[in-house]
């Protein structure tokens, strides 16, 4: 009996035409939502003039349906037992699940004004940038609609830059009509313990963003894991959103619509400083903002974002060091609301429910030659927004799953 079940599972989790896994893998049967909360700055003038603490108030959720598009360019390679694909990006606004419209306005950090002097530190260039910032009437903060902030707007300051660069700015620009990948993953045909594990991303086995082993692409994309998951296992996965591989550890057993699942959580250790977790030393790539690598809970992903000063954290700086959150007022980190988890069905290794939570922050530093930033007395890692991407197996699919998998085992 057990041998037969194991054989069936091993057959059905292989990523090839005709298996249960393949059908759900090509196009997820789960409805995935991405909720955004925007940090609306309450005292922009006070900050720019007096370098005060930044007072923020989160507004949301603003909800989009995502990951509804099927994988494309799916190509099996029978020689190395891999399958390659790209994942198209798309987002559809869901007004009924949102507190307002895409036209709602927010006061946020001026992304271009903050980023430009960080990228161009040459003093002559900063004099030029300053004149363009003034000419375009730009300042440290700006008011933008949700749609502009997320998906892009034509920046008035960048439009004056004296050579032809992209003048469109947005936290997720470009998104719609783009693809993530190419991913090449093991299909499990020759070795089921490697199924869904990423062999390469964008044609490379490393990211070229981090030194040493931090640069490795480890594990799967978190949508599934090799079958027969044990509680003692560390689940490793790669997230292109945060430009790194990360891991989850067993947290608890959960009953999900009658299916027993293991809840794996991202441990605080994953965001620790090298002092607390020496394994993280290669994620600390600069010494100043990180206070000589003693700060924790924020990840500088600038190398992955064309040199822009983008920092990723957990929402409300959960698990971050006090020096990071100290200059910001209005944050209320909460483990339940702000942590990331994966609910994995242990026999198949399928993720049946998940909540991915992360926060996008931008570093802004004092810049003597930039009038909009010259009054700042300290650097700030400014929260722009946080997101909660969730998916849960549908009732119908759950029933089917129970019948075909867990029911048979009982």
């Amino acid at each position: 009996g057990d041998m037969l079940i194991e054989k069936t599972i091993k057959r059905e989790v292989v990523l090839e035409e005709g298996t249960t896994a393949f059908k759900n893998w090509v196009k997820t049967g789960t409805t995935v939502y991405r909720q955004f909360w925007i940090f609306d700055v309450q005292n922009p003038d006070d900050v720019a003039k007096n370098s005060s603490k930044i007072k923020v108030k989160q507004r949301g959720p603003y909800t989009y349906r995502v990951r509804y598009l099927a994988k494309e360019n799916i190509t099996q390679d029978p020689e190395d037992h891999t399958v390659s694909f790209v994942q198209p990006n798309g987002a559809i606004f869901e007004p009924s699940l949102s507190v307002g419209t895409e036209d709602d306005n927010f006061t946020v950090l001026n992304l271009a004004v903050a980023a430009a002097p960080h990228i161009y530190q040459n003093s002559f260039v900063q004099v030029v940038l300053n004149s363009l910032i003034k000419k375009s009437k730009s300042s440290m903060f700006q008011t933008r609609s949700l749609k502009e902030l997320l998906w892009g707007y034509k920046d008035p300051f960048l439009s004056l830059v004296p050579y032809p660069i992209s003048t469109t700015v947005g936290v997720f620009y470009p998104y719609n009509d783009t693809v993530d990948g190419v991913y090449k993953v093991f299909n499990g045909k020759d070795n089921i313990s490697k199924v869904a594990i990423i062999e390469s991303y964008k044609g490379k086995r490393n990211l070229s963003y981090w030194p040493s082993y931090c640069d490795m692409i480890n594990g799967t994309d978190a949508a599934s894991f090799p079958p027969f998951v044990e509680k003692s296992r560390t689940l490793r996965f790669f997230s292109s959103d945060i430009c790194r591989s990360i891991y989850a550890v067993f947290g608890s057993e959960i009953d999900l619509k009658g299916i027993p699942v293991y809840r794996f959580v991202l441990p605080a250790n994953a965001f620790a400083s090298p002092l607390q977790n020496p394994d993280n030393h290669c994620f600390c790539t600069e010494k100043v903002i990180s206070n000589n690598c003693t700060s924790y809970g924020v990840l500088d992903i600038g190398k992955c974002k064309e040199g822009k000063p983008v920092y990723i954290s957990l929402p409300h700086f959960l698990h971050a060091s006090p020096d990071v959150s100290e200059p910001i007022e209005g944050l209320h980190p909460n483990e339940d609301e702000h942590r990331t988890y994966l609910d994995v069905e242990p026999i198949t290794g399928f993720t049946l429910q998940f909540a991915k939570r992360l926060q996008v922050n931008i570093l802004v530093k004092p810049a003597r030659k930039i009038e909009a930033l010259k009054n700042l007395k300290r650097p700030y890692i400014v929260p722009i927004l946080w997101l909660n991407e969730t998916g849960t197996i549908g009732d119908e699919k759950a029933e089917m799953f129970k019948t075909q998998v867990t029911g048979k085992i009982k």
Epitope: I119, Q121, N122, V125, L160, P162, Y163, P164, E306, G307
Partner: antibody, heavy 115, light 108 residues
Framework: EEKLEESGGGLVQPGGSMKLSCVAS????????MNWVRQSPEKGLEWVAE??????????HYAESVKGRFTISRDDSKSSVYLQMNNLRAEDTGIYYC??????WGQGTTLTVSS | ENVLTQSPAIMSASPGEKVTMTCRAS???????LHWYQQKSGASPKLWIY???NLASGVPARFSGSGSGTSYSLTISSVEAEDAATYYC?????????FGSGTKLEIK
């Protein structure tokens, strides 16, 4: 203060090859598009080639007169930009400058193509 | 390609005089992408005016630039001896990038 130093010029016969190098300092080299511009008494200032950033997949552009013969490349770890020139012609003679255009230019290196 | 024609090719002026040199483009371009360089004898070119009218760092206020579309100019309100040089216009609007043939300013 930003500084650019070209090297590799000299005398070469028509049909020959030459590689010019340029080392930059005083600015974050990896953030700037880099160009080679040449100057001769006959043609004045003439743009030769441009290379963009890693984030632009090191996209390149060339003047029509050098397309297929010249190759621009960069090594951000060495703050250097290069110009590999093949099948050289007499009209390629001139002073070659490397520059991010809107910043300082180097002093140039002289290439003479002559038999 | 967008050909830039500068005139006059050579001009001479006495100290204190006002001088204007022009740069004409064969096709219209954004004023953001038209720049001027100064080159003194035996030296490499220096950015002088960027985006049609913005003076580069250290450029005296007697210099100014203006123009739009296909017609651009550089003006010196009161020429000084140190202004003797060749001035080139350059466009960064499209490829190939092009330079004008230069205007040589001599001081009497």
């Amino acid at each position: 203060e930003e500084k650019l130093e070209e090297s590799g010029g000299g005398l070469v016969q028509p049909g020959g090859s030459m590689k010019l190098s340029c080392v930059a300092s005083g600015f974050t080299f990896s953030n700037y598009w880099m160009n080679w511009v040449r100057q001769s008494p006959e043609k004045g200032l003439e743009w030769v080639a441009e290379i963009r950033l890693k984030s632009n997949n090191y996209a390149t552009h060339y003047a029509e007169s050098v397309k297929g013969r010249f190759t621009i490349s960069r090594d951000d770890s060495k703050s250097s930009v290069y110009l590999q020139m093949n099948n050289l012609r007499a009209e390629d003679t001139g002073i070659y400058y490397c520059t991010p255009l809107l910043l300082r230019w180097g002093q140039g290196t002289t290439l003479t193509v002559s038999s | 390609e967008n050909v830039l024609t500068q005139s006059p090719a050579i001009m001479s002026a006495s100290p204190g005089e006002k001088v204007t040199m022009t740069c004409r483009a064969s096709s219209s371009l954004s004023s953001t992408y038209l720049h001027w360089y100064q080159q003194k004898s035996g030296a490499s070119p220096k950015l002088w005016i960027y985006s049609t009218s913005n003076l580069a760092s250290g450029v005296p206020a007697r210099f100014s630039g203006s123009g739009s579309g296909t017609s651009y100019s550089l003006t010196i309100s009161s020429v000084e001896a140190e202004d003797a040089a060749t001035y080139y216009c350059q466009q960064y609007s499209g490829y190939p990038l092009t330079f004008g043939s230069g205007t040589k300013l001599e001081i009497k």
